[in-house]
Interface confidence: low
């Protein structure tokens, strides 16, 4: 396994609708054909997998149908969007990139993007 540099923004604020987007960029040391991207969430020293997708370079990322993630790729950049976030989902979201094919296998893990999610204030009752 060879190491690879992965860059991602330090902080992202989710929208009022609970959507957060960030770019995960990797320094490919060769001509990868197949890439796997995994988003991990670290909170309270626990790391859990949020979503993962394997894609051919130049193709759309295909996450599972019930995934909260969507994404697109452009060269060595992956644009990731996580939906359905609530305040309790605030945490460090780490981008993990693996160059799956052809060999050699490369692995890169970003430093993480701190995503802050603020639940919207409920609308006050109105007679109108």
């Amino acid at each position: 396994c060879k190491a690879m540099h992965v860059a991602q923004p330090a902080v992202v604020l989710a929208s009022s609708r609970g959507i957060a987007s960030f770019v995960c960029e990797y320094a490919s040391p060769g001509k990868a054909t197949e890439v796997r991207v995994t988003v991990l969430r670290q909170a309270d020293s626990q790391v859990t997998e949020v979503c993962a997708a394997t894609y051919m370079m130049g193709n759309e990322l295909t996450f599972l149908d019930d995934s909260i993630c969507t994404g697109t790729s452009s060269g060595n950049q992956v644009n990731l969007t996580i939906q359905g976030l609530r305040a309790m989902d605030t945490g460090l979201y780490i981008c993990k990139v693996e160059l799956m094919y052809p060999p050699p296998y490369y692995l890169g893990i970003g430093n993480g993007t701190q995503i802050y999610v603020i639940d919207p204030e409920p609308c006050p009752d109105s007679d109108f």
Epitope: K31, E34, T54, M57, G58, M100, P104
Partner: antibody, heavy 124, light 113 residues
Framework: EVQLVESGGGLVQPGGSLRLSCAAS????????IHWVRQAPGKGLEWIGI????????NYAQKFQGRVTISRDNSKNTLYLQLNSLRAEDTAVYYC?????????????????WGQGTLVTVSS | DIQLTQSPSSLSASVGDRVTITCRAS??????????LAWYQQKPGKAPKLLIY???NRATGIPSRFSGSGSGTDFTLTISSLQPEDFATYYC???????????FGQGTKVEIK
């Protein structure tokens, strides 16, 4: 012996479909990406598409997009090519070919093992 | 997409001759110091056979009379001393990623003079 053997060729009506198979032996099939390449009579080589080793991700040449499907069954060491809406210009010998990879120092590439090819004739 | 142009499209040569085939790419095929260009030999009625990969590396079992050179956009396949079994058609091929595309040159037919 490392080999690929194509089958399923023959005469197909215009507008019809073909499904070709490529049986692999002598190597660990699930470790390699495999390609389909075709060659019209008296013409050059034309790349159709690639399927990756384990996930089965695919990519196709622009001219075949929407008309071709490549799939694989690693448990059967077999690769498949489905080509739809056939026309006369799809008449060709269809080859499957293994993607070379070697060592840990770089992304060496090339098609190092080829099948013998299977002839598909599209005619009414 | 990158286009590959081979020259000549055909040539006549004798056994023992030194033969050179060129392949020109419409833009550089180099990436991280590697030229992603391969050469194949094809005989009538047979599947292509890999000769050279990464512009200059001989594939397993290929005789030393075959050599590849070049970088960037200009590449050469040389057969130092043509043998009877070398009369065939030769193709260059380039690989690019994002998305993966594999492009072949139009071929060069080497015939007996």
């Amino acid at each position: 012996e490392v080999q690929l053997v194509e089958s399923g060729g023959g005469l197909v009506q215009p507008g019809g479909s073909l499904r070709l198979s490529c049986a692999a032996s002598g190597f660990t099939f699930s470790d390699y990406a495999i390609h389909w390449v075709r060659q019209a009579p008296g013409k050059g080589l034309e790349w159709i598409g690639i399927i990756s080793p384990s996930s089965g991700s695919t990519n196709y040449a622009q001219k075949f997009q929407g008309r071709v499907t490549i799939s694989r069954d690693n448990s059967k060491n077999t690769l498949y090519l489905q080509l739809n809406s056939l026309r006369a210009e799809d008449t060709a010998v269809y080859y499957c070919a293994r993607d070379i990879h070697s060592g840990s120092s770089g992304y060496y590439y090339g098609f190092d093992v080829w099948g013998q090819g299977t002839l598909v004739t599209v005619s009414s | 997409d990158i286009q590959l142009t081979q020259s000549p499209s055909s040539l006549s040569a004798s056994v023992g001759d030194r033969v050179t085939i060129t392949c020109r790419a419409s833009e550089s095929v180099d990436f991280f110091g590697i030229s992603f260009l391969a050469w194949y030999q094809q005989k009538p009625g047979k599947a292509p056979k890999l000769l050279i990969y990464d512009a200059s590396n001989r594939a397993t079992g290929i005789p030393s009379r075959f050599s590849g050179s070049g970088s960037g956009t200009d590449f050469t396949l040389t057969i130092s001393s043509l043998q009877p079994e070398d009369f065939a058609t030769y193709y260059c091929q380039h690989y690019t990623s994002s998305p993966p595309v594999y492009t072949f040159g139009q071929g060069t037919k080497v015939e007996i003079k």
